[in-house]
Structure formats: C-alpha cells, structure tokens
C-alpha cells in the first residue's frame, strides 16, 4: 500500500530544511516542504510524507521523476519520486538525477568526459506520459554534448525540459526528444487521458502556457469522443 511505502522510508528520508535538495535513495517518496501562511508565510518542514501526485515528469521537481510508488502499481496512482543517482537502475532518462542519463538500464554521467553522443531511448510509453516499461523497445539517437552547456533552442535534442530555453519544453519527436514551443492560446493541445496506457505518442506536444489549460473547443462539444478538438484556453 502507499502508506507502507511511505512508512518504510520514514527514518532515512526525512525532508531537508527549507526546501533544500536532499540525497534520497531512488525509491523514496518526495517529502516536500510547504509554506504555512498562518505563521507569517514561513517555510515549514513536516516530518511525515507528502506524496505529490503527477502524470508526467514535468510536474515534479528537477530532482524527481513521476512513477508509481510500488512495482506494477495502479496507473492512477503516480507520485513524484526522488531521482536515481549514478550507477542506479533506470528505465528512462528522467529517472536519473540531473547530470546523468539512462544508458542500458543504468544511470550514467552525462559529463563531457563520459558522454559519447549515444543515448538509449526507451520508446514504448504511456500516452502523453513519460512512463516507460521494462519491455520497451530501444532506439539510439545522437545527441551533442554541447546541450549541457547552453539551453537548447527550438529543435535542439533534449532529455528534459530544463535542457530547453525559456518558453520551450522537451517533447518527443519520432524516436528522440527535442525542444518545442510551449503552446499558446488557441493552439491545439493533447488532453491526457485519465488512466492507463494508450500507446505511443510519436509527436508529443508541449503543455499549454501559463494561465492556459487544455479544454474542448466550444464548437466541438457535439462531436464524438474520438474527434473532439482540444485547444489551450484561458482559465
């Protein structure tokens, strides 16, 4: 159960003070500090766990990835988990801590010295999410190590959105991921389905920009479920 996962980490993964990053083991549930308004807007760390639900890695912090807290867990229960350090097992790049990537199921350093321009990319993923399965097929894609020094511009190959410049996100394009523009008002968006895997999204769109959400276009309400058009609209 979720509680047993939380409790099993109760001693070794106490949250750090003031929201600082901590060296969690990869399986730890994120213990996130919050802001307590009654006490004068001060940060307060809380010693019990605060699971943070997510559907994709982008909803989590830079030192986290999104996954089920238990092996083979319910697809509808995914939370932000602490990233995996070097030499830890992985299934996709986002599982590895910044400065590392997933190669042959292990987190390895992406430093220039170690990086050889080859990344293993697992492509069998949930619809709109970045949750690979162990039986995924692997493709190889070439990536310039230069991207680790400057923020990627539109079309640059990336591993995660933090590799991309402001206003861009890292999204799948064929078998690799590239920096694409965050969607603007009126642009067509992908409404992520509630539960379960719905195949591979080969051309992944970015999320809607700030103050926008992905909703059914007004004049498409009568259309059938499969043909409904979603666009980025003001809240």
């Amino acid at each position: 159960t979720l509680n047993s996962v939380l409790n099993s980490n109760a001693i070794k993964n106490l949250p750090p003070p003031l929201g600082g990053a901590a060296g969690h083991p990869g399986s730890a549930v994120s213990a996130a500090p919050g802001i307590l308004y009654p006490g004068g807007n001060k940060y307060q760390t809380i010693d019990n766990y605060q699971p943070y639900p997510c559907a994709e890695d982008e909803e989590c912090g830079t030192d986290e990835y999104c996954a089920s807290p238990t092996r083979g867990g319910d697809a509808g229960v995914q939370i932000c988990l602490a990233c995996r350090k070097r030499r830890k097992r992985c299934m996709r790049h986002a599982m590895c801590c910044p400065g590392n990537y997933c190669k042959n199921g292990i987190c390895v350093s992406s430093d220039q010295n170690h990086f050889r321009g080859e990344i293993e990319e697992t492509i069998t993923e949930s619809f709109g999410n970045d949750h690979s399965t162990l039986d995924g097929y692997s493709r190889r894609t070439t990536l310039s190590s230069k991207m680790y020094h400057t923020k990627g511009q539109e079309g640059s190959v990336c591993l995660r959105s933090s590799d991309c410049a402001s206003g861009l996100c890292c999204a799948r394009h064929f078998w690799s991921k590239i920096c694409k523009p965050v969607l603007k008002e009126g642009q067509v968006c992908t409404k992520h389905r509630r539960k379960g895997s719905h195949g591979l999204e080969i051309f992944q769109r970015c999320y809607c920009g700030e103050g926008l959400s992905c909703r059914i276009q007004k004049d498409h309400h009568q259309a059938s479920n499969s043909s409904r058009l979603h666009t980025c609209q003001r809240h």
């Epitope: 929201g19 990053a21 919050g34 997510c54 559907a55 982008e58 912090g61 932000c80 995660r160 933090s162």
Partner: nanobody, 124 residues
C-alpha cells in the same frame, strides 16, 4: 502569493458526509497538484489525499481510501474533498494544499503551499 481558502467544515454525526471546498488564487505556475492534509489535536499533520493538475493521478491515505474522494475544477482553481462514512477519528483541522511541482521553475522538489484550515468534528 498563493492564497487558499477552505470551506465546508463543521459538526457531523458518525456515518455522515461533508464536502470540503478549497478556492485557490494567485496560482501562477503551469502545472500544480491540489491536496488535503489534516491535523488532529495533539497529533502531527498527516496526508489525506491529492490530485494532479489533469486529474490523471489521485493519491489517498489508506485510512480514507474508499470513503473520501478528491476532485478539482481547474477552470475555477478549486479543489474538493467529498468525505463519506465519517468516523470520530476523522475529527481534525483539514488543510488545503496547492502544490508547485514546477520543474520549469527550477524547483528541485515538488512542494505545497498551505491554507488556514477548516475544522471537521465527527461526534454524536
């Protein structure tokens, strides 16, 4: 800054139901979760339930699973907690929490902002 206002708390008999609401304002980040936590007298604050921004992932504490349902209305920036089959041990101050996972804002870890809390008393 984020402001969270809870409502719907009150006195209810065991077996009864309540629906808590949480209105959030000042949320500027693109992707957020909303959650509920509670603190009983003399106890630590504990996690109750949370839902991610798209509704694709919901998480519940074992103690409320099957009895409580969390939902959210993105267009209104409002979260709800439907509490059924209430027990005396559910008596607590219930806090709404708005999360900022915010990878695109460079946060190393997802985190929550807290509301002031609303009291729920389950007693006959």
């Amino acid at each position: 800054e984020v402001q969270l206002v809870e409502s719907g708390g009150g006195l209810v008999q065991p077996g009864g139901s309540l629906r808590l609401s949480c209105a959030a304002s000042g949320i500027t980040f693109k992707r957020y979760a909303m959650g509920w936590f509670r603190q009983a007298p003399g106890k630590e604050r504990e996690f109750v339930a949370a839902i991610n921004w798209s509704g694709a992932s919901t998480v519940y504490a074992d103690s409320v699973k099957g009895r409580f349902t969390i939902s959210a209305d993105n267009s209104k920036n409002t979260a709800y907690l439907q509490m059924n089959s209430l027990k005396p041990e559910d008596t607590a101050v219930y806090y709404c929490a708005a999360g900022n996972g915010g990878r695109q804002y460079g946060h190393s870890r997802a985190r929550y902002d807290w509301g002031q809390g609303t009291l729920v008393t389950v007693s006959s």
